[in-house]
Amino acid sequence: AGVFELQIHSFGPGPGPGAPRSPCSARGPCRLFFRVCLKPGLSEEAAESPCALGAALSARGPVYTEQPEAPAPDLPLPNGLLQVPFRDAWPGTFSLIIETWREELGDQIGGPAWSLLARVTRRRRLAAGGPWARDIQRAGAWELRFSYRARCELPAVGTACTRLCRPRSAPSRCGPGLRPCAPLEDECEAPPVCRAGCSLEHGFCEQPGECRCLEGWTGPLCMVPVSTSSCLGLRGPSSTTTGCLVPGPGPCDGNPCANGGSCSETPGSFECTCPRGFYGLRCEVSGVTCADGPCFNGGLCVGGADPDSAYICHCPPGFQGSNCEKRVDRCSLQPCRNGGLCLDLGHALRCRCRAGFAGPRCEHDLDDCAGRACANGGTCVEGGGAHRCSCALGFGGRNCRERADPCAARPCAHGGRCYAHFSGLVCACAPGYMGARCEFPVHPDGVSALPAAPPGLRPGDPQRAGVIAVIVVVVIAIVAGIVVLVISRKKRMAKYEKAEIKEMGEMHRELNA
């Protein structure tokens, strides 16, 4: 067993005229991802035939947006290696297919738009355990630079990963089913660097940073001895190590997780974290692919050009998670404004608006005049996102629902007496004062302290009648404007109320469906 590793160094326009400026189409930004497919032997196989040695899909690269004036650079690539695990011997000769895919991000609402930008196919000879091999390949107008290697996973070694080895000091380990351990060669290549503190005597690792225990030892660093000796006969002590005792209480001893899964201890048991493409209690079930239908809720499964490659799910609106298995709580984004109630109906969102607001997201402010009409002949006045009622004489309060005593505010100045009247109030002024509110003193010479009239507008001036007529016309125009405003507002209310009733009916229908 082992791993084929591919490192993409750069992907960009090749040299020479006619090189593309951007991998993206005119529809906007895009990002790249790569797919590697391995086939045994050197035969020229059709691209669609299965990737018998394995396949892998990279993560998505960073978003690329073309700069109009800048020269086309090497494009931003996904991080990390592409790794293709192989279970059997490494064949030595193989076909390497690398595909560069473009994912367009112009409009994600309708799902991804992706297309194959370039495909390179190379037939190669490669020994496992050797150094990185570098290559540059052209695919149409594009150029791809990459390195690759095959490496064995301990205890396998050799150019085909068929020889088994162990550290010289390590005791024999038992295979599955408690059979005698397979004969192992004594020589080993330098082991990978294990987790810091991992016991040199009782621990080993197959991947850098891990610490796996030999029989008879347990604990995160393999320092804790299991109570019984590791290689006693099953039916009592035996001079020959023909059998092994069942591993001790450490549930992760000997790592029960297959296919590169990592084991973590849980109370009285263990849990395997499987690498992408494997599942099952011990990661023993071969890779999940698009052929398993892993994308729930109508997600699109993207797996390159054959059913046996790794997969990625593109989720339709309302779903998320690596398998589109989680419903997005779209109401958590608080799409309904002005205190509207959000309802997620699955295929759509609905906002139930508070009185005074309307629209799909309750974005239209009706200034509350809809739900709180002014009573007793009052008129609703808009302004500043709030409503105000201008009440008819004799009424007051927020909605003109309260009877008002017009004399309560003592409107008559200078000791004038207030009399309530059906049309308002009347002030009887104290001697020496005049005016509607007794606000003007009367001078001894009989002339009131009224503001002086402009020249040419003295009492009895012939122009006076004309000015009065103009004022009357202006007042009538203002009154007419207010009437028109009130009528149009009432029509608007009726329209929104009708729409709201219709929307509520639809909402009930959808919720009951």
Epitope: D107, I109, G110, G111, P112, A113, V288, T289, C290, A291, D292, G293, P294, N297, G298, L300, C301, V302, G303, G304, D306, P307, D308, S309, Y311, H314, P316, P317
Partner: antibody
Amino acid sequence: QVQLQQSGAELARPGASMKLSCKASGYTFTSYGISWVKQITGQGLEWIGEIFPRSGNTYDNENFRGKATLTADKSSSTAYLEVRSLTSEDSAVYFCARTTVFAPYYFDYWGQGTTLTVSS
Amino acid sequence: DIQMTQSPASLSVSVGETVTITCRASENINSNLAWYQQKQGKSPQLLVYAATNLADGVPSRFSGSGSGTQFSLKISGLQSEDFGSYYCQHFWGLPWTFGGGTKLEIR
């Protein structure tokens, strides 16, 4: 060559159940999905659901939930559609179709169809 | 559910003419759309997938176009074997739905 061979025409009583079959040949059965489509005579097409034979996963149209059950037998490369509690509205031609498992999706091969008649 | 609206519902044309059938999705489905042809008493046949890609063995007189919500299937120089019904189908979110169909008849 790829073929989907469906079972013959069926006559059933209201309230009964009927299991229709679709035998695949000429390709790896577990590398594709099988979708089922209903067509009432003289009308359009309606997708019932899809099964992935490799895993047994099924995805269905909610309109057929409780009405249709999809299964598959890998050993015989056969997919099945069981229609329960039959009524006259279930009288239709039922097609099975091979479905790509990776996007872009499409139904590239169809069975010849099975006519189901529900009558008392 | 995404609704697929096909137009026209029926069309009467002569051999050699060019026809265009349209399909409108109620939501953006990008290019997740296929077209099928069905002849009387037969099963449907795939013509176009991913909105614009011609299926294997389909004559080049057929072409698909569109993206988002508006799609069309064009048949240039109709042949006698092209008469029948045509359906569009989306593949974006469940359930996958078909258009109501367009019946193409000989004039």
